[in-house]
Amino acid sequence: QRFAQAQQQLPLESLGWDVAELQLNHTGPQQDPRLYWQGGPALGRSFLHGPELDKGQLRIHRDGIYMVHIQVTLAICSSTTASRHHPTTLAVGICSPASRSISLLRLSFHQGCTIASQRLTPLARGDTLCTNLTGTLLPSRNTDETFFGVQWVRP
Amino acid sequence: QRFAQAQQQLPLESLGWDVAELQLNHTGPQQDPRLYWQGGPALGRSFLHGPELDKGQLRIHRDGIYMVHIQVTLAICSSTTASRHHPTTLAVGICSPASRSISLLRLSFHQGCTIASQRLTPLARGDTLCTNLTGTLLPSRNTDETFFGVQWVRP
Amino acid sequence: QRFAQAQQQLPLESLGWDVAELQLNHTGPQQDPRLYWQGGPALGRSFLHGPELDKGQLRIHRDGIYMVHIQVTLAICSSTTASRHHPTTLAVGICSPASRSISLLRLSFHQGCTIASQRLTPLARGDTLCTNLTGTLLPSRNTDETFFGVQWVRP
């Protein structure tokens, strides 16, 4: 049983358990489709253990395969709103470094007011993830309706 | 290779791998919006390793950050049904202890008949998770259409 | 600190971190509702670490509880397309061995053009997962719109 205790005393960083869950801070100025995120216990149930925020965008600190997940709910919305404002699309991707820029996950709202998805993807230290919401509708800032997170899964 | 074997002989509990996947048992009586869950190998592919059920609600046994996920499909539903019965909303939250009561995840059905989402959230030993379905539509009890689960991710 | 280094030198296989993320290769011939998947670094951001592909279907190599996730976007689609072609349904299940055949996860598109979900489920070495898309609409092959993956969570 000593072994288990020893394991628990190890710094979690050595196990590579990087994880973050973010809440929406604000949207960008016109012509900037990015969502800007915030996290930390003072804000509620959001947190960053490993990854960091760089001007509201999530930056990865450890190479590995990550589970990336997101939910975005539109703030003023019913099924008719969503379809009339079509296309409203959310895309999550690596936006820097530019050499690694790629769209990882993309969803359109069509007749819904919420999108939610998740995927596994390799990420490298220094990758910055951006979440772009295109269209005229604003996302809800409620922390149970709009959130974005990553979880390190394996090297 | 001895080290790997030693690790596998450790009780999994010491690694903190708490996990549960539940299937719908029944809905509550009128005025009780909660869904009541069940789990265990005798029921099919649902299980509880660590967390427990307390009167159909999921109680956490280990502090940590958890991935919470859910899918709920409405039982007798088409897109017109869903929109006519709007708002039908599902919320997952901590319902006890009362001092920690909070909504973790919220989705409306709008013109769809299924919602599915997931998020990372800190949970503490003794937290009970409730899933509230508000509206007049009933959820499907099919185990591949309606399910709810948690996975311990890190301390 | 030596212990952490020793742990990192262990083959990952001994930790049971099997994981795969696949991209759509093609759909089946008529009367075959299965989606055929592909994965590997040469293809982009898809990969297989542990599980294998068997004629485009995912075969599990290690017993355990897995998180299974999927997103499928219809290729030529608007909310009216989706509703006119209803029912278009996606089901993920164990298709072989026949003795373990079961539907694990099922979603209909209704008025949406994307479905995304995830669940925890026990899988055994040799289980082959199939993803069946029924209906007349084709899935998008864009790697950020349609993907399928599994992650080993615990024994």
Epitope: I76, T81, R84, T136, N142, T143 | G93, S103 | -
Partner: antibody, heavy 119, light 107 residues
Framework: QVQLVQSGAEVKKPGASVKVSCKAS????????ISWVRQAPGQGLEWMGW????????HYAQKFQGRVTMTRDTSTSTVYMELSSLRSEDTAVYYC???WGSGWYVDYWGQGTLVTVSS | DIQMTQSPSSLSASVGDRVTITCQAS??????LNWYQQKPGKAPKLLIY???SLQSGVPSRFSGSGSGTDFTLTISSLQPEDFATYYC?????????FGQGTKVEIK
């Protein structure tokens, strides 16, 4: 600078209907909703519902469901709130306001329209 | 519906005083809380949004704090133009609801 200009005061008899207008200028008529909030004399603020000027989509508070109708005219950037089956307790100042929606806030308000219901 | 309870319902204070108004929600609303100031015969004016963010153009003597169910509006040094009624409002879920108001009067 966004401005919301409302129609003038109204006096109505019980059982009648009233239609208040709210004209928007100085901003795009797009991402936000127009909410209606009322305030009875000497009382607090009460949210009635919103309309999305772009889509015409509405969301009403349960309390007013069946009695309130919100509409819009995109050509004049005007939204309307009609309240039917008036009773004396509907006597209030009715405000229109720019509402960013769920999790956000109301930032610009009209000057208010006093509706008096009296026999 | 979510009930919002403000206290006190009224208070008397002098110019230069530090004033604190509290608002309690009947259920957790995270940080989806806004504060408004209203003067007699005028429309409300947004002061604080998302519990603690200062609206553009609002003096920095106004600040907000809190999360979950308990929130506070603080005026660090009361000025003559601050005598008014203050309302909290939740934007967590419809129907959006307001507190009953706190009237700040001159002592």
């Amino acid at each position: 600078q966004v401005q919301l200009v409302q129609s003038g005061a109204e006096v109505k008899k019980p059982g009648a209907s009233v239609k208040v207008s709210c004209k928007a200028s100085g901003g795009t008529f797009s991402s936000y909703a127009i909410s209606w909030v009322r305030q009875a004399p000497g009382q607090g603020l009460e949210w009635m519902g919103w309309i999305s000027p772009n889509s015409g989509d509405t969301h009403y508070a349960q309390k007013f469901q069946g009695r309130v109708t919100m509409t819009r005219d995109t050509s004049t950037s005007t939204v309307y709130m009609e309240l039917s089956s008036l009773r004396s307790e509907d006597t209030a100042v009715y405000y229109c306001a720019r509402d960013w929606g769920s999790g956000w806030y109301v930032d610009y308000w009209g000057q208010g329209t006093l509706v008096t219901v009296s026999s | 519906d979510i009930q919002m309870t403000q206290s006190p319902s009224s208070l008397s204070a002098s110019v230069g005083d530090r004033v604190t108004i509290t608002c309690q929600a009947s259920q957790d609303i995270s940080d989806s809380l806004n504060w408004y100031q209203q003067k007699p015969g005028k429309a409300p004016k947004l002061l604080i949004y998302s519990a603690s963010s200062l609206q553009s153009g609002v003096p920095s003597r106004f600040s907000g704090s809190g999360s979950g169910t308990d929130f506070t509006l603080t005026i660090s040094s009361l000025q003559p133009e601050d005598f008014a009624t203050y309302y909290c409002q939740q934007s967590f879920t419809t129907p959006y609801t307001f507190g009953q108001g706190t009237k700040v009067e001159i002592k």
